[in-house]
Interface confidence: low
């Protein structure tokens, strides 16, 4: 192992260094040679250099004192080399109104101080983007703020006091967007202990899709350093990063339609929230509206969802049909509604968890039923589940990655429907992909609104 000859390091420091590089820089320890002390080049040295370069240290490739000091500094638990929801180039929130909920409160601070720190942290990002954040106290929020210690159900256990302070997941459903704070830290409103506001600004950056910055002045730099919260400002690098994802505060063109305005059907940027067949018709859902396309007829009509189904909400997120039963399932957040023969069934909505989804799944992006073998595919973030409609249970071995099993599709989709006995039509933003599930490949790329003769 490349040790500085003037530095006498204990074995546990060497192991600590390996663990740190494994956790934050993707070092694969099982690929290191058995004779570590004779190891002269490549893997370990490269990872040390990568870390030194990223964190602005002198690049020596040695586990020197300053490198070990940096390794011991309190920091965010998100890797600097990204395997944690793959944030760079990864998902963003596709809406500008984002909800958050504080799941539980640290006993270290007054509840009001926690509320204030989290609200101000969100405000830091809303000040430089078109994003608007609102706190909700019940129900499913986009971003869940959690205080937890040790192993807490996400395969990224905390490590006691010091070390990892917090971590957060990039945008997405379920655990996506959630920010977790290590309860073994002492959370404060000031410079003592760990400042909740500063840590939250950083973690919310991840929740919005930012990765770590190598600029030591950036709030997205991996390690924690207290700065005066009264004069705190985002660095130019932070602002550049977040505006590359969401634009500046004046950029409202990507905001969802106000509830009262009908989306322009032939807008080349039009995307849909959900699409499904209903008999010989295709329903396209968007905000509070749906378009009805009758097969083989060019004419289409727009309707309010509430005009057909007054008890249903706007913003349907997923839909699928089981034609043989005359049933349509509609999904929003963690609930679903059953429509039979175009009439809403009583005793709905019900929880999506009755399908057998794990608790971290909080919404469905898209769903499609394949009558060839009676399975429904549920698409959630970059994964999908397969549900056996006959046995009313999830098939084993799921979820799976969309990109792995639907060639050319993903990583996320907005909507999908099944047609012509062999095609799935996947919708991603303003694009649509005709996918032949017998050949298992895309056979056509279209605009999402191609069904309307645009």
């Amino acid at each position: 192992l490349p040790l500085n000859s003037s530095t006498s390091l204990e074995k546990n420091n060497v192991l600590f260094g390996e663990r740190y590089l494994e956790k934050f820089y993707g070092l694969e320890i099982n690929k290191l040679p058995v004779t570590k002390m004779k190891y002269s080049g490549n893997l370990m040295k490269e990872k040390i250099q990568e870390m030194q370069h990223f964190l602005g240290l002198k690049v020596t490739g040695q586990l020197d004192t300053s490198t070990l000091e940096m390794m011991h500094a309190p920091r965010c638990g998100v890797p600097d080399v990204h395997h944690f929801r793959e944030m760079p180039g990864g998902p963003v929130w596709r809406k500008h109104y984002i909800t958050y909920r504080i799941n539980n409160y640290t006993p270290d601070m007054n509840r009001e101080d926690v509320d204030y720190a989290i609200r101000k942290a969100f405000q830091v990002w809303s000040n430089v983007t078109p994003l608007k954040f609102s706190k909700i106290n019940t129900g499913m929020a986009d971003i869940l703020v959690v205080f937890a210690r040790g192993a807490h159900g996400d395969f990224h256990a905390f490590d006691g006091k010091g070390g990892i302070l917090a971590h957060a997941f990039g945008p997405g459903s379920g655990i996506g967007g959630d920010a977790h704070f290590d309860e073994d830290e002492f959370w404060t409103t000031h410079s003592g202990g760990t400042n909740l506001f500063l840590t939250a600004v950083h973690e919310i950056g991840h929740s919005l899709g930012l990765g770590h910055s190598s600029d030591p002045k950036a709030v997205m730099f991996p390690t924690y350093k207290y700065v005066d919260i009264n004069t705190f400002r985002l660095s130019a690098d932070d602002i550049r990063g977040i505006q590359s994802l969401y634009g500046d505060p004046k950029e409202n063109q990507r905001l969802p339609n106000p509830d009262n305005s009908e989306p322009a059907l032939c807008d080349p940027n039009l995307s849909f929230d959900a699409v499904t067949t209903v008999g010989n018709k295709i329903f396209f859902f968007k905000d509070r509206f749906f378009w009805l396309k009758v097969s083989e007829r060019p004419k289409t009509s727009v309707n309010l969802i509430s005009s057909l189904w007054p008890t249903l909400p706007s913003g349907i997120e997923a839909a699928y049909e089981i034609e043989a039963r005359n049933q349509v399932f509609l999904f929003k957040d963690d609930k679903y509604w059953l429509i039979s023969n175009l009439r809403p069934e009583p005793n709905y909505p019900k929880s999506i968890h009755s399908f057998g989804f794990p608790n971290f799944v909080k919404k469905i992006d898209a769903a499609v039923f394949n009558p060839r073998f009676y399975r429904t595919y549920f698409f959630v973030d970059n994964q999908y589940w397969r549900y056996d409609e006959r046995r009313q249970m999830m098939d084993p071995g799921y979820p799976k990655l969309i990109t792995k099993n639907f060639q050319g599709i993903g990583p996320k989709i907005d909507a999908v429907f099944y047609s012509k006995n062999k095609y799935y039509y996947f919708f991603q933003g303003s694009n649509q992909f005709e996918y032949d599930f017998l050949l298992q490949r895309i056979t056509k790329t279209l605009k999402s609104n191609s069904w309307f003769g645009c």
């Epitope: 043989a324 056996d388 006959r390």
Partner: antibody, heavy 136, light 110 residues
């Protein structure tokens, strides 16, 4: 105990019709694929049709499409094969069979579940067969 | 259509012999291949499913394997009650027809 009992076979003239029944016991036919397979005298096995009763979904071999209809009455736990426009080449012993997938324990399903195929159409229980003779 | 070409069509063997029967699929059928045993005047019995999974109650001398589009049924030590006709069967949700059988292999006493 799972049991399948076919009935309804017999001698029929070309162009005639017959209705075969398959009475199931020991399991709920609603949630199983049911298959009809035939075997001409001295020949091999030939799949004829399949149904998944709770959906009413049906599949047919090209050789019988448009002439045969598979159906099920879940209240009677019975599957049927309605055979119209019968031809000499339809002469065979007709077996009804249940699909294996229904009987796989959940643990076993994990091992055999594939991305696109979950042990489709494998017949674990068969009836004794009923002979259909089409002759003038 | 997916064809299943079974070979040999018949074979003679003695008790204790190792017997191998092969089925070749005309195209990829994943591993959804089953093997059945049929005795004269009786219904077929399931032996193997998913190419290599032994159906419950079937003696362990029966085994199945796959190599590409070739599927093999092996009887490691032939017993008197094993003299019968054996059929392979492919199945796919995606093929038309979804189920096809091989022509059969008759195993006779030498």
């Amino acid at each position: 105990e799972v049991q399948l009992v076919e009935s309804g076979g017999g001698l029929v003239q070309p162009g005639g019709s017959l209705r075969l029944s398959c009475a199931a016991s020991g399991f709920n036919l609603s949630y199983s694929y049911m298959h009809w397979v035939r075997q001409a005298p001295g020949k091999g096995l030939e799949w004829v049709a399949s149904i998944y009763p709770s959906y009413g979904s049906t599949y047919y071999a090209d050789s019988v499409k448009g002439r045969f209809t598979i159906s099920a009455d879940t209240s009677k736990n019975t599957a049927y094969l309605q055979m119209n426009s019968l031809r000499a080449e339809d002469t065979a012993v007709y077996y009804c069979a249940r699909d294996l997938e229904e009987s796989l324990p959940k643990r076993a399903r994990t091992a055999v579940s594939k991305e696109l195929e979950s042990v489709p159409y494998v017949m674990d229980y068969w009836g004794q067969g009923t002979l259909v003779t089409v002759s003038s | 259509d997916i064809q299943m070409t079974q070979s040999p069509s018949s074979l003679s063997a003695s008790v204790g012999d190792r017997v191998t029967i092969t089925c070749r699929a005309s195209q990829s059928v994943s591993s959804a291949v089953a093997w059945y045993q049929q005795k004269p005047g009786k219904a077929p019995k399931l032996l193997i499913y998913s190419a290599s999974s032994l159906y419950s109650g079937v003696p362990s001398r029966f085994s199945g394997s796959r190599s590409g589009t070739d599927f093999t049924l092996t009887i490691s030590s032939l017993q008197p009650e094993d003299f019968a006709t054996y059929y392979c069967q492919q199945s796919s949700h995606y093929a038309s027809p979804p189920i096809t059988f091989g022509q059969g292999t008759k195993v006779e006493i030498k």
